[in-house]
Interface confidence: medium
């Protein structure tokens, strides 16, 4: 039993770290493998994660982490029975993948603008809450060439969009993702898309 691609781990920096790795042949991850993890800290408990299959030879483990702080380092050991396949460490603050923004909604706004709003996926308690910036992708459902990308670098999870920048009568979809620049994070997954019809007529008629 061998590891082809060693574990790559990311943390949402609030409750979960996810590690993924690839074996050298199709493997029943949950039956054959265990990932043990322990905060590199005197007296901390050793935990075991039972991996699941993502593909035939790709295993994924989701590990609950508790109130991560910057200095936390986890010792990771991948076992196949009594055989140690891989050993390494993981620092959640250095491998952040933010949670996906939620509840993306489009509202008609004054002066022929659309107001896109979504929710910050972190509670105010969390260090990432005030660190997120967003990318909004707006695309024409019937014209793959007609799309726009907006970077929202201010703190509020909103974007105002002039209706005149979009084709009249066309159906548009928007989705949003987040990243934490100060943590040099990866991008979050995209939110589910929300769709609306772009009209120029006065809003009162709709």
């Amino acid at each position: 039993v061998k590891v082809l691609h060693e574990p790559s781990c990311f943390s949402d920096y609030i409750s979960t770290s996810v590690c993924q790795w690839k074996m050298d042949h199709p493997t029943n991850c949950s039956a054959e493998l265990r990932l043990s993890y322990q905060l590199d800290f005197m007296g901390s408990e050793n935990h075991t994660c039972v991996p699941e299959n993502r593909e035939d030879s790709v295993c994924v483990c989701s590990m609950p982490i508790d109130d991560a702080v910057e200095a936390d380092v986890y010792q990771l050991d991948l076992w196949a029975g009594q055989q140690l396949l891989w050993s390494g460490s993981f620092q959640p603050s250095k491998h952040v993948k933010p949670r996906t923004p939620g509840n993306l909604t489009v509202y008609p706004n004054i002066s022929h603008t659309w107001l896109l709003m979504w929710t910050n996926p972190y509670p105010t308690e969390n260090h990432l809450h005030s660190e997120l910036t967003y990318m909004v992708n707006v695309s024409n459902d019937n014209d793959p060439e007609d799309f726009k990308v907006y970077n929202v670098t201010y703190m509020g999870p909103t974007l105002r969009l002039a209706a005149s920048t979009l084709k009249s009568g066309a159906s548009y979809s928007a989705r949003v993702r987040a990243w934490a620049q100060t943590y040099n994070s990866t991008w979050s997954d995209w939110s589910p898309s929300t769709t609306w019809l772009n009209y120029y007529e006065p809003w009162e008629q709709h």
Partner: antibody
Framework: QVQLQQPGAELVKPGASVKLSCKAS????????IHWMKQRPGRGLEWIGR????????KYNEKFKSKATLTVDKPSITAYMQLSSLTSEDSAVYYC???????????WGQGTLVTVSA | DIVMSQSPSSLAVSAGEKVTMSCKSS????????????LAWYQQKPGQSPKLLIY???TRESGVPDRFTGSGSGTDFTLTISSVQAEDLAVYYC????????FGGGTKLEIK
């Protein structure tokens, strides 16, 4: 405006339990964690723990793990803290606070004075 | 656990004077990524709940008079009241939120 309403006082006997309430208004209850603090007369403040009203998830100060139990009732937008096996050491004012965060606890209840006495 | 120590435990000043009080933490509260110090200051007047004055060590909470200033970084922090008013009679607490939450023992401000 944001308000956290707590009863003024509770008198309880040693060995008994008491359930303190904290009713929220003026904001979306599930948006902010509720924190609980203890303050004994003439003493400083101690953080007891917090609860996420959305999920019910809790986190406790180790010192209070076997003393306090935090719960919420979403329909009544109320958070509760049950204190068990009370002794005179538990006589204190207990505060709930919201918008507890890396910013600060911006909203506080008025506090409930718990007196443990035979 | 992070331990917070405040000094002095009490002080008495006349109205109009400048006051400084200190708060020290047993480990750094500076997040090297966000460059924020997770340190807040609270004011508790007699018979009242604590009130948030300063967060992130130096950011004044909305509505707080500008005579209150927070400073410091890492493990050493200071709250300064530039010109004490009679209504500033209170106990002042610092609190860390770098790793869970711990309050200092408080500094009691009395007006002569």
């Amino acid at each position: 405006q944001v308000q956290l309403q707590q009863p003024g006082a509770e008198l309880v006997k040693p060995g008994a339990s008491v359930k303190l309430s904290c009713k929220a208004s003026g904001y979306t209850f599930t948006n902010y964690w509720i924190h609980w603090m203890k303050q004994r007369p003439g003493r400083g403040l101690e953080w007891i723990g917090r609860i996420d009203p959305n999920s019910g998830g809790t986190k406790y100060n180790e010192k209070f793990k076997s003393k306090a139990t935090l719960t919420v009732d979403k329909p009544s937008i109320t958070a509760y803290m049950q204190l068990s096996s009370l002794t005179s050491e538990d006589s204190a004012v207990y505060y709930c606070a919201a918008f507890g965060s890396t910013y600060g606890f911006a909203y506080w209840g008025q506090g409930t004075l718990v007196t443990v006495s035979a | 656990d992070i331990v917070m120590s405040q000094s002095p435990s009490s002080l008495a000043v006349s109205a109009g004077e400048k006051v400084t009080m200190s708060c020290k933490s047993s480990q750094s509260l500076l997040n090297s990524r966000t460059r924020k110090n997770y340190l807040a200051w609270y004011q508790q007047k007699p018979g009242q709940s604590p009130k948030l004055l300063i967060y992130w060590a130096s950011t004044r909470e909305s509505g707080v008079p500008d005579r209150f200033t927070g400073s410091g970084s890492g493990t050493d922090f200071t709250l300064t009241i530039s010109s004490v008013q009679a209504e500033d009679l209170a106990v002042y607490y610092c609190k860390q939120s770098y790793n869970l939450y711990t309050f200092g023992g408080g500094t009691k401000l009395e007006i002569k």
